[in-house]
Interface confidence: low
Amino acid sequence: KPCHGLSAPENGARSPEKQLHPAGATIHFSCAPGYVLKGQASIKCVPGHPSHWSDPPPICRA
């Protein structure tokens, strides 16, 4: 089963910008200039019933 898309962090971006991600997919986070990423830059959709993200989404701090 797929994982549902996560929101981009405030003052940041995520890629790919999909609403559903197949099990095994990786999504990547980055921050706008002047902000520092706190947390995992890449997280994965771990297969399961249901599938789930390997980590919580990061945040961007000034």
Partner: antibody, heavy 119, light 107 residues
């Protein structure tokens, strides 16, 4: 049917830059990421970086300062630029893509561009 | 970065025989492992992803297994066209990294 075709120079002088173009067909660059991988006898297969469907990039941190990956969605082209080449950058350079935008394994490969760094 | 170690650089094989190629990761990669076949002058060809999932068009004599850090590619009833170099690749952690390859050579 997915295809990736590469073009670019085969010989680069030391300290100069490398530019390779990967032209894709069978899928849209807005929906899929395209990666660059190189292969040399000394270092084996080495992932260089990726440009995702949304346009963001990730690079191998060991090469990040010398790499740039860009694309033109309308022309279905992805561009690799690498600066300050040295002899140990001599390798076969491949563009590759996965089964969907989030994958970092490679179901489709270009034919490769053999790059020789030599004076 | 996660290091991928293929313990055998070369394996001497017999047609019709069974071959087992091993790959060990320096950290747990949770089955995020791919296997590729490469023949001289060609790009790598994806055989298996997710440690066990055979790609479309790959003969059923190929199979993948393993978990944690240790993974195996098996080929049963080896055919002439299987003589090639095989690479493992992890994609659990960015950057994705490859093993150095195992080259099959006919006895």
């Amino acid at each position: 049917q997915v295809q990736l075709k590469q073009s670019g120079p085969g010989l680069v002088a030391p300290s100069q830059s490398l530019s390779i173009t990967c032209t894709v067909s069978g899928f849209s660059l807005t929906s899929y990421g395209v990666d660059w991988v190189r292969q040399s006898p000394g270092k084996g297969l080495e992932w260089l970086g990726v440009i995702w469907g949304g346009g963001s990039t990730n690079y191998n941190s060991a090469l990040k300062s010398r790499l740039s990956i860009t694309k033109d969605n309308s022309k279905s082209q992805v561009f690799l630029k690498m600066n300050s080449l040295q002899t140990d950058d001599t390798a076969m350079y491949y563009c590759a893509s996965g089964d969907y935008d989030g994958s970092l394994w490679f179901a489709y490969w270009g034919q490769g561009t053999l790059v020789t760094v030599s004076a | 970065d996660i290091q991928m170690t293929q313990s055998s650089s070369y394996l001497s094989v017999s047609l019709g025989g069974r071959v087992t190629i091993t790959c060990k990761a320096s950290d747990h990669i949770n089955n995020w492992l791919a296997w590729y076949q490469q023949k001289p002058g060609n790009a790598p060809r994806l055989l298996i992803s997710g440690a066990t999932s055979l790609e479309t068009g790959v003969p059923s004599r190929f199979s993948g297994s393993g978990s944690g850090k240790d993974y195996t590619l098996s080929i049963t009833s080896l055919q002439t066209e299987d003589v090639a170099t095989y690479y493992c690749q992890q994609y659990w952690s960015t950057p994705p990294t490859f093993g150095a390859g195992t080259k099959l050579e006919l006895k």
